[in-house]
């Protein structure tokens, strides 16, 4: 299993939207991809979950564009705020 986030950093103005890319490799038949936000304290905050057999997930300002064939799961954060400045991680799980 492998997860790759190629964007090391990205900058966008407040109120707009940003898309964070994540590619993965897995041999699992059924799985989930999770997106987390890491606070300065290093605490990880869960944002949204995408199931391998589910339609694109959406929760408020967070939405996922899931392309199973391409093994891509991009997170879009819209209505950006200064408080969104942080490190974002995607994770793969069964």
């Amino acid at each position: 299993q492998k997860v790759t986030q190629a964007q090391s950093s990205v900058s966008m103005p407040v109120r707009k939207a940003v898309t964070l890319n994540c590619l993965y490799e897995t041999s699992w038949w059924s799985y989930y991809i999770f997106w987390y936000k890491q606070l300065p304290s290093k605490e990880m905050i869960f944002l949204i979950r995408q199931g391998s057999d589910e339609q694109n997930a959406k929760s408020g300002r967070y939405s996922v564009n899931f392309k199973k064939a391409a093994k891509s799961v991009a997170l879009t954060i819209s209505a950006l705020q200064l408080e969104d400045s942080a490190k974002y991680f995607c994770a793969l799980g069964e």
Epitope: A17, G60, R61, S78, A79, Q81, L82, E83
Partner: antibody, heavy 118, light 111 residues
């Protein structure tokens, strides 16, 4: 289930003050920007004020700038609107709304009524 | 400020037919490929309800008979087929820049 419940409205004399509250539940309040929007009787919608999740960014409509103050208490999941120097034209239903995708207002409270009259 | 002009101010549509509401912005509400235009429905005595965000995205739980289109300065809300429960006032709203602004509203009557 997302819920927003406004309170604090009432009848105030011109020049008076009032503080509105909006109690939020069913979502991570500290992760969302919040707005106040008002609607005068038989009129359209007018945006009033915005506060970001951690209160770092605040905007006001020109019509209320210097008179209204938006604030929030993330520990208590509550949004506030302090209104001073009230005028008859501030008479309206006041709604709090959550800022959703693409800065839309995806959830609204039922509103609280402010009447400014002598 | 971005001024939003809705037309018509009111319209009457027969049950099952199409209702089309236009919203024109005084300047573009697009940014980086996204259109920051949203549509709301408001029934008497109720708060507004989000129908469409970012010009064409249907909000969760909203029937597929509602659709939005447009970019730049010209946007359209379509309802087809219209149902009795769609009688309401509809507002467009731009969120591209401060201050957030609303159109004047369009009152839909079902014949």
């Amino acid at each position: 289930e997302v819920q927003l419940v406004e309170s604090g409205g009432g009848l105030v004399k011109p020049g008076g003050s009032l503080k509105l509250s909006c109690a939020a539940s069913g979502f991570t309040f500290s992760d969302y920007g919040m707005h106040w929007v008002r609607q005068a009787p038989e009129k359209g919608l007018e945006w009033v004020a915005y506060i970001s999740s951690g209160s770092r960014t605040i905007y006001y409509a020109d019509t209320v700038k210097g008179r209204f103050t938006i604030s929030r208490d993330n520990a208590k999941n509550t949004l506030f609107l302090q209104m001073t120097s009230l005028r008859s034209e501030d008479t309206a239903m006041y709604y709090c709304a959550r800022e959703g995708a693409y800065s839309s207002f995806d959830y609204w409270g039922q509103g609280t009524t402010l009447t400014v009259s002598s | 400020d971005i001024v939003l002009t809705q037309s018509p101010a009111s319209l009457a549509v027969s049950l099952g037919q199409r209702a089309t509401i236009s919203c024109k912005a005084s300047q573009s509400v697009d940014y980086d490929g996204d259109s920051y235009m949203n549509w709301y429905q408001q029934k008497p005595g109720q708060p507004p309800k989000l129908l469409i965000y970012a010009a064409s995205n249907l909000e969760s739980g909203i029937p597929a008979r509602f659709s939005g289109s447009g970019s730049g300065t010209d946007f359209t809300l379509n309802i087809h087929p219209v149902e009795e429960e769609d009688a309401a006032t509809y507002y467009c709203q731009q969120s591209n820049e401060d201050p957030w602004t609303f159109g004047g509203g369009t009152k839909l009557e079902i014949k």
